[in-house]
C-alpha cells in the first residue's frame, strides 16, 4: 500500500480520484473549504468535499449496497429459480406419461372404448396439470367427471355392445346411475384420495418454491433508506474528503453500520428458517400417496382394475340399470363375455410397486440439502456484505467514520454516529412495507406447509395399502375390494430417470405394451427403454 501522502494543500488528489466517479471537476474544490454545507461527511477542519460530491457519494453508496445485496443472493436465487422450473417441467412430464400410460391401457385392452376414452382421459389430465399450477379446480369433481364420462361408453360398448341406436339416449341416466349404484366400487374414491393428496402436496411444493423466488427478488431490489445511505457514505467515502484514499473502514464499524442498514431485512430470518424447515418436512412426507409421480404413473392400473370390477358385475348391473333407465325392453342382448382370468383375484392384490433410481424424490431431497445451506442467509447478510466490501483486517489503522484510528472502538464510533443520526432509531423504524408484506406471505406459506395433511407421527407400514388393508385382505364388502390387479405387481421402473430424460416425451403409439393385445399385468411397464 502506498505511503500516506503529505497534507493536500490543493485537493489535487481528491479531484483526481473523484473523476473516477464523475467526469469533470466542477464539483470539487480546488483548495480545502470549510464544508459548512456538508450533511454527512462533517469535517473537523477544512475539507476537499462539496455538497454535490457528498450527494454523488451517497448515490454511489446506495447503488453499491444494492449491487452487493444482489451478488449475495445470486447463488440462492439461481438455485430456487432453476429448481422451480425443473420441477414444474418434470411434473408436466409425469402428467404426460400418466396420460399416455392410461391411453395405452385403453388401446391395448379396450379398443372399442377409444377414441372417447382418449378424450375423457385427456380432459382429466389437463385438469390435473391446471390444478398443479394453481387453478381453482376440485379434484373430486375431476375424478367424478372422468368416471361419469367413462361409464356410459363402457356400458354401451362393453356391457351391451349390441344396443340399438334408439337406446343410446340414456347417457345422462347412466351418468347418474354410475354414482348411485357405485358401479366402479370404491375405485373412484381411492383415486380421489390418492390424486387429491398427491396433487395438493405437489401444488404447495411449487407454490413454496415460487414464493422463495419472490422473497429473494424482494430483498434483492430493496431501496435503502436515506439514513442508511448516509451511514454507508460515511463509512466508505467520507475518508476521501480528508485525502485518505488508501484507508479502509474498520471491520467492527462496518458490522455496526450493516446491522443498522439491514435491520428490516434481517427480520425475515426467523420466517425464512421456518420456511426451509417446513419445506423439508413437506418433502420428507412426499412418498406413496403423497408422491404424485407414484400416484399418477400407477393410475392406469387402478382405472383398469375399476373397469374389470364393472365387467365382473356386468350381469347384475345390466339388470338394475335396465330398470333404472327405463329401457328394460331392450335388455335382451346378452352382456359381453369376459374370461374369468380377468377378474380380480382378491388374494393377490398388490399396490403398484415403484423402483426408484434418480427420481423426482431424490432430486427434491437434494434441493432441500442445498437450501439448508442457506438457512442463515438473512441473519448472515450483514457479515457477508462486510466481508465482500473493503474493510481493514484486524480493525487496525482504519476509518471509523470520523477519522483514521489505530484501533476501532465501537463505543467511540457509536458516539460519533449519534451526532448525525441515531442508529437505534434506524433499527426501531421497523421493516419496509415490502419486507412486511413478504414476511406475511412467508407466514402464510409456512402455515400451509405445516398444516398439509401429511403422514405424521407414524411411518406407514410398507405392507399396508392406502386404505390400511394388508395385501390380500379386503374390507367387509368383498365386491369393494381395491388395489393393483393381476397375479403380481405392476412395476413402474425408474419412474423418471430424472434429469437425463427430462425432455423425453412418450407418444401413445410408443407406450408400453402396444406390441401385443395384453393386459398391463403381462407387461413390465418401463418408462424408458434402457
Amino acid at each position: 500500500q502506498p505511503p500516506p501522502p503529505p497534507p493536500d494543500a490543493t485537493c489535487h488528489q481528491v479531484r483526481s480520484f473523484f473523476q473516477r466517479l464523475q467526469p469533470g471537476l466542477k464539483w470539487v474544490p480546488e483548495t480545502p473549504v470549510p464544508g459548512s454545507d456538508l450533511q454527512v461527511c462533517l469535517p473537523k477542519g477544512p475539507t476537499c468535499c462539496s455538497r454535490k460530491m457528498e450527494e454523488k457519494y451517497q448515490l454511489t453508496a446506495r447503488l453499491n449496497m444494492e449491487q452487493l445485496l444482489q451478488s449475495a443472493s445470486m447463488e440462492l436465487k439461481f438455485l430456487i429459480i432453476q429448481n422451480a422450473a425443473v420441477f414444474q417441467e418434470a411434473f408436466e412430464i409425469v402428467v404426460r406419461h400418466a396420460k399416455n400410460y392410461t391411453n395405452a391401457m385403453f388401446k391395448n385392452n379396450y379398443p372399442s372404448l377409444t377414441p372417447q376414452a382418449f378424450e375423457f382421459v385427456g380432459e382429466f389430465f389437463t385438469d390435473v396439470s391446471l390444478y398443479i399450477l394453481g387453478s381453482d379446480i376440485n379434484v373430486d369433481d375431476m375424478v367424478n367427471e372422468l368416471f361419469d364420462s367413462l361409464f356410459p361408453v363402457i356400458y354401451t360398448q362393453l356391457m351391451n355392445p349390441g344396443l340399438p341406436d334408439s337406446a343410446l339416449d340414456i347417457n345422462e341416466c347412466l351418468r347418474g346411475a354410475r354414482r348411485d349404484l357405485k358401479v366402479f366400487g370404491n375405485f373412484p374414491k381411492l383415486i380421489m384420495t390418492q390424486v387429491s393428496k398427491s396433487l395438493q402436496v405437489t401444488r404447495i411444493f411449487l407454490q413454496a418454491l415460487n414464493l422463495g423466488i419472490e422473497v429473494i427478488n424482494t430483498t434483492d431490489h430493496l431501496k435503502f433508506s436515506k439514513d442508511c445511505g448516509r451511514m454507508l457514505t460515511r463509512m466508505w467515502y467520507c475518508s476521501y474528503c480528508q485525502g485518505l484514499m488508501m484507508v479502509k473502514p474498520c471491520g467492527g464499524y462496518c458490522n455496526v453500520v450493516m446491522q443498522g442498514c439491514m435491520a428490516g431485512v434481517v427480520e425475515i430470518d426467523k420466517y425464512w428458517r421456518e420456511y426451509i424447515l417446513s419445506l423439508e418436512e413437506l418433502v420428507n412426507g412426499m412418498y406413496r400417496i403423497y408422491d404424485m409421480e407414484n400416484v399418477l404413473l400407477g393410475l392406469f392400473s387402478t382405472i383398469h382394475d375399476s373397469i374389470q370390477y364393472v365387467q365382473k358385475n356386468a350381469g347384475k348391473l345390466t339388470t338394475t340399470i335396465g330398470k333404472l333407465c327405463a329401457h328394460s325392453q331392450q335388455r335382451q342382448y346378452r352382456s359381453a363375455y369376459y374370461p374369468e382370468d380377468l377378474f380380480i383375484d382378491k388374494k393377490v392384490l398388490k399396490v403398484a410397486h415403484v423402483e426408484h433410481e434418480e427420481t423426482l424424490s431424490s432430486r427434491r431431497r437434494e434441493l432441500i440439502q442445498k437450501l439448508k445451506s442457506f438457512i442463515s442467509f438473512y441473519s448472515a447478510l450483514p457479515g457477508y456484505i462486510c466481508s465482500h466490501s473493503p474493510v481493514a483486517e484486524n480493525d487496525t489503522l482504519c476509518w471509523n467514520g470520523q477519522e483514521l484510528v489505530e484501533r476501532y472502538s465501537q463505543k467511540a464510533a457509536r458516539n460519533g454516529m449519534k451526532n448525525q443520526f441515531n442508529l437505534h432509531e434506524l433499527k426501531m423504524k421497523g421493516p419496509e412495507p415490502v419486507v412486511s408484506q413478504i414476511i406475511d406471505k412467508l407466514k402464510h406459506i409456512n402455515q400451509l406447509l405445516r398444516t398439509m395433511s401429511m403422514p405424521k407421527g407414524r411411518v406407514l407400514d410398507k405392507n399396508l395399502d392406502e386404505e390400511g388393508f394388508e395385501s390380500g385382505d379386503c374390507g367387509d364388502d368383498e365386491d369393494e375390494c381395491i388395489g393393483g390387479s393381476g397375479d403380481g405387481m405392476i412395476k413402474v421402473k425408474n419412474q423418471l430417470r430424472f434429469l437425463a430424460e427430462l425432455a423425453y416425451d412418450l407418444d401413445v403409439d410408443d407406450a408400453p405394451g402396444n406390441s401385443q393385445q395384453a393386459t398391463p399385468k403381462d407387461n413390465e411397464i418401463s418408462t424408458f427403454h434402457n
Epitope: R20, L21, T60, N64, L68, W236, Y237, M245, M246, K248, H388, S389, P390
Partner: nanobody, 116 residues
C-alpha cells in the same frame, strides 16, 4: 490473501514509453474493475484510469491521450501502456483493485523515473 504483484518500470528516456504489468492472484480477477494510480515524489495520489471486467476503460482526462490500460483475464494480468513520457511522469505507479468504488488492494508499487 489477495495479491497484486507489479513488474516493469525503471529508467525511461523523455519521449519514451513504459509498459507495466500487474499479476493478480487469490481472487476472481475477471469479476473486478482494476485501476492504475500514481504518486509523484512528495505529492498526493493521482488516479490514472480504470478498466472494467468487461474490458471497457475510462481515464483521467489529463492523461487520456497518452495512456492505454488493458487486461488479460485468462492470465489474470493488468497492463499500463504510457507514451511520450515527460519528467513530471516520474512517480511510483500502483495497480489497485476496485471494490465498492474504492481501492481495496494495492500492488507493491513500481518506480518509474523519466530522465535523460
Amino acid at each position: 490473501q489477495v495479491q497484486l504483484v507489479q513488474s516493469g518500470g525503471g529508467l525511461v528516456q523523455p519521449g519514451g514509453s513504459l509498459r507495466l504489468s500487474c499479476a493478480a492472484s487469490y481472487f476472481d480477477f475477471d469479476s473486478y474493475e482494476m485501476s492504475w494510480v500514481r504518486q509523484a515524489p512528495g505529492k498526493g495520489l493521482e488516479w490514472i484510469g480504470s478498466i472494467y471486467h468487461s474490458g471497457s476503460t475510462y481515464y483521467n482526462p489529463s492523461l487520456k491521450s497518452r495512456v492505454t490500460i488493458s487486461r488479460d483475464n485468462s492470465k489474470n494480468t493488468l497492463y499500463l501502456q504510457m507514451n511520450t513520457l515527460r519528467a513530471e511522469d516520474t512517480a511510483t505507479y500502483y495497480c489497485a483493485r476496485v471494490n465498492m468504488d474504492r481501492f481495496d488492494y494495492w500492488g507493491q508499487g513500481t518506480l518509474v523515473t523519466v530522465s535523460s
